[in-house]
Amino acid sequence: CKAMHVAQPAVVLASSRGIASFVCEYASPGKATEVRVTVLRQADSQVTEVCAATYMMGNELTFLDDSICTGTSSGNQVNLTIQGLRAMDTGLYICKVELMYPPPYYLGIGNGTQIYVIDPEPCPDSDF
């Protein structure tokens, strides 16, 4: 297993609709054709695999399970979007990138993006 640098923004604020997007960029040492991207959440004394996708370079990301994540890839960048977030989902979201094929296997883990989620205030009742 060889190490690889992964960069991601330090902080992202989710939209009022609970959507957060960030770019995960990896310094590919070679020409990988198969890449696996996993988003981990570290918070509340837990580590959770939020979503994971494997893709062939130039193709769409295919996420596992009924994922709350979507994404696109462009070169060595992966644009990730996490939907349906609520205030309690605030936490550090870490991008993990694995170059699966061809060998050698490379692994890179980013420092994490702190995603802040603020639940929208309910609209006050109106007489009009």
Epitope: E49, V50, L64, D65, I82, M88
Partner: nanobody
Framework: EVQLVESGGGLVQAGDSLRLSCAAS????????MGWFRQAPGKEREFVAA????????SYADSVKGRFTISRDNAEKMVYLQMSSLKPEDTDVYYC??????????????????WGQGTQVTVSS
């Protein structure tokens, strides 16, 4: 409806390994998030690990990360908790639970609809 039955608990020495099993009944097992929780007498139930419906995604409490591994076999309707490098503080009753909700960034807080009766794990020093 899902019925859950845990097994595999027992008395072990610190540093030993143990594998807990959870047998589920019900045709829709593969659509449930499965979790393991533990509870000591007089204490609150504590999240240990969870696994997504397909088994592709997992979640662990920091206290067990790297020592415990959760897995599932949807064909056999089984969930497992492989526990290694056990410590005396792992002593608890371990419960298997099922939640019919989408995977989320915090499966520990999901609403678990079904629970097993628990299996005792005792780790002596």
């Amino acid at each position: 409806e899902v019925q859950l039955v845990e097994s595999g608990g027992g008395l072990v020495q610190a540093g030993d390994s143990l594998r807990l099993s959870c047998a589920a009944s019900g045709r829709t097992f593969s659509s449930y998030i499965m979790g393991w929780f533990r509870q000591a007498p007089g204490k609150e139930r504590e999240f240990v690990a969870a696994i997504s419906s397909s088994g592709a995604l997992t979640s662990y409490a920091d206290s067990v990360k790297g020592r415990f591994t959760i897995s599932r076999d949807n064909a056999e309707k089984m969930v497992y908790l492989q526990m290694s490098s056990l410590k005396p503080e792992d002593t608890d009753v371990y419960y298997c639970a099922a939640a019919r909700v989408p995977w989320s960034p915090r499966p520990s807080l999901s609403t678990y609809d079904y629970w097993g009766q628990g299996t005792q794990v005792t780790v002596s020093s």
